[in-house]
């Protein structure tokens, strides 16, 4: 058995359903995406040995599903998947990878072929600990590369300052596949949001630990860099589920006046 979870039940139906639903979010210029053709291109990787799937095996899938990302709307992240999805609000505020078509169809799903058979493996799938060239990791590598290449304007990045190993994983999708593929001539600046979990530890903030490494790397690459601790719009969203926690107390005079009233 592999270390990862098996192929998601009803993979094809979920994929095609998400694709059809997403088409309505696309601009008139791009809404004629052929979901069946996109699925067939994705399925190519499901016909291969689960440890022999390369990022390039998803090239046709990406070419068929790729669409434009509005300027200033890209939102990269590490260790904050659910928060990013909630904040992006189905492309309304931002368009993270999970909110572009090629990311949406696979978000939170798992897939692989059986090791010595042609069927899908619903029991387990390989992770990077089992083998590097597994179907899921290779998919997200290829998708991340494309997402970076197609991002423009102000680039936003949400990192988790409560993550025990640090806010910026030195080895991660953002570090290894996204930063190297940012197109410098299309980018005005990079804005980092270091978010801390409500009531969670403050492991790192802007300018500390791994964040210093990230800042140096981006500046060395010639990017204009800024960093915000607990970006307020996101913090307010976090506080929806922790309204009585001290971290969520409204501190402004106006808010105090409203409470008295």
């Amino acid at each position: 058995r592999w270390r990862g979870e098996g192929t998601s039940a009803h993979l094809r139906d979920i994929f095609l359903g998400r694709c059809a639903e997403y088409r309505a979010l696309l601009s008139p210029e791009q809404r004629n995406k052929n979901c069946t053709a996109i699925w067939e291109a994705f399925k190519v990787a499901l016909d291969k040995d689960p440890c022999s799937v390369l990022p390039s095996d998803y090239d046709l899938f990406i070419n068929l599903s790729r669409h434009s990302i509005p300027r200033d709307k890209s939102l990269f992240w590490e260790n904050s998947h659910l928060l990013v999805n909630s904040f992006a609000d189905n492309t309304r505020r931002f368009m993270p990878l999970s909110d572009v078509l090629y990311g949406r169809v696979a978000d939170f799903l798992s897939w692989c072929r059986q090791k010595n058979d042609s069927g899908l493996d619903y029991q387990s799938c390989p992770t990077s600990e089992d083998c590097e060239n597994n179907p899921v990791d290779s998919f997200w590598k290829r998708a991340s590369i494309q997402y970076s290449k197609d991002s423009s304007g102000v680039i936003h990045v949400m990192l988790n300052g409560s993550e025990p190993t640090g806010a910026y994983p030195i080895k991660g999708f953002f570090a290894d596949y996204e930063i190297p593929n940012l197109q410098k001539e299309k980018i005005t600046r990079i804005e980092i949001w270091v978010m801390h979990e409500i009531g969670g530890p403050n492991v790192e903030s802007c300018g500390e630990g791994s964040m210093k490494v990230l800042e140096k790397r981006l500046k060395d690459m010639g990017f204009q860099y800024s960093c915000i601790n607990d970006y307020r719009p996101v913090k307010l969203l976090q506080c929806v589920d922790h309204s009585t926690h001290p971290d969520c107390a409204l501190k402004s005079a106006a808010a105090a006046t409203q409470r008295k009233a």
């Epitope: 601009s27 008139p28 210029e29 791009q30 809404r31 004629n32 995406k33 669409h67 434009s68 990302i69 509005p70 300027r71 200033d72 197609d150 423009s152 304007g153 299309k186």
Partner: antibody
Framework: QVQLVQSGAEVKKPGASVKVSCKAS????????VHWVRQAPGQGLEWMGA????????DYSQKFKGRVTMTRDTSISTAYMELSRLRSDDTAVYYC????????WGQGTLVTVSS | EIVLTQSPSSLSASVGDRVTITCRAS??????LAWYQQKPGKAPKLLIY???TLGEGVPSRFSGSGSGTDFTLTISSLQPEDFATYYC?????????FGPGTKVDIK
Amino acid sequence: QVQLVQSGAEVKKPGASVKVSCKASGYTFSDYWVHWVRQAPGQGLEWMGAIDGSDTFNDYSQKFKGRVTMTRDTSISTAYMELSRLRSDDTAVYYCARGGLLQYWGQGTLVTVSS
Amino acid sequence: EIVLTQSPSSLSASVGDRVTITCRASENIYSYLAWYQQKPGKAPKLLIYNTKTLGEGVPSRFSGSGSGTDFTLTISSLQPEDFATYYCQHHYGTPFTFGPGTKVDIK
């Protein structure tokens, strides 16, 4: 209010190139595609192609591929359409229009190709 | 690419007449069809999109119907300012294409 203002009329020789500009105002330029549509004298509307707001994608009509180039300069909210290797049957009024629905149009630019 | 055909290519009508123009697509375009009005020397004006949604400031005498491959533009009571050429256009992804046009002139 949304406005698209195009450059003035051009007269060109066959084989030359023409570059038409389209300056946008009244909306966030990078949020919308810009389309180019032409109309030969007494003829119908012909879609030539479009360029997306982030300057990542362009999509050209098969008829014009290899001859047309669409670009945009977000800093001055201006889109450009360049048509090369002009022929006499390229004589037309060239319009830019804001996508995705073509609700707002420029006033048109007459390009005359004549020897 | 999707080919749009319009009929009739021209028609003569009088003020107050009910006028119907049809547009047929070579493949399914769902409800993604728009109609434009163009007067001589002017840029086209968006009348209807998504088959039946009226554009900004378009009078209610204009209406659209259909889905899939067959669509209709109806002017319930033709007014003097409605004499013009009408084009259908699909907005189901690029390449966008236009129909050849229908000229409505005075009988």
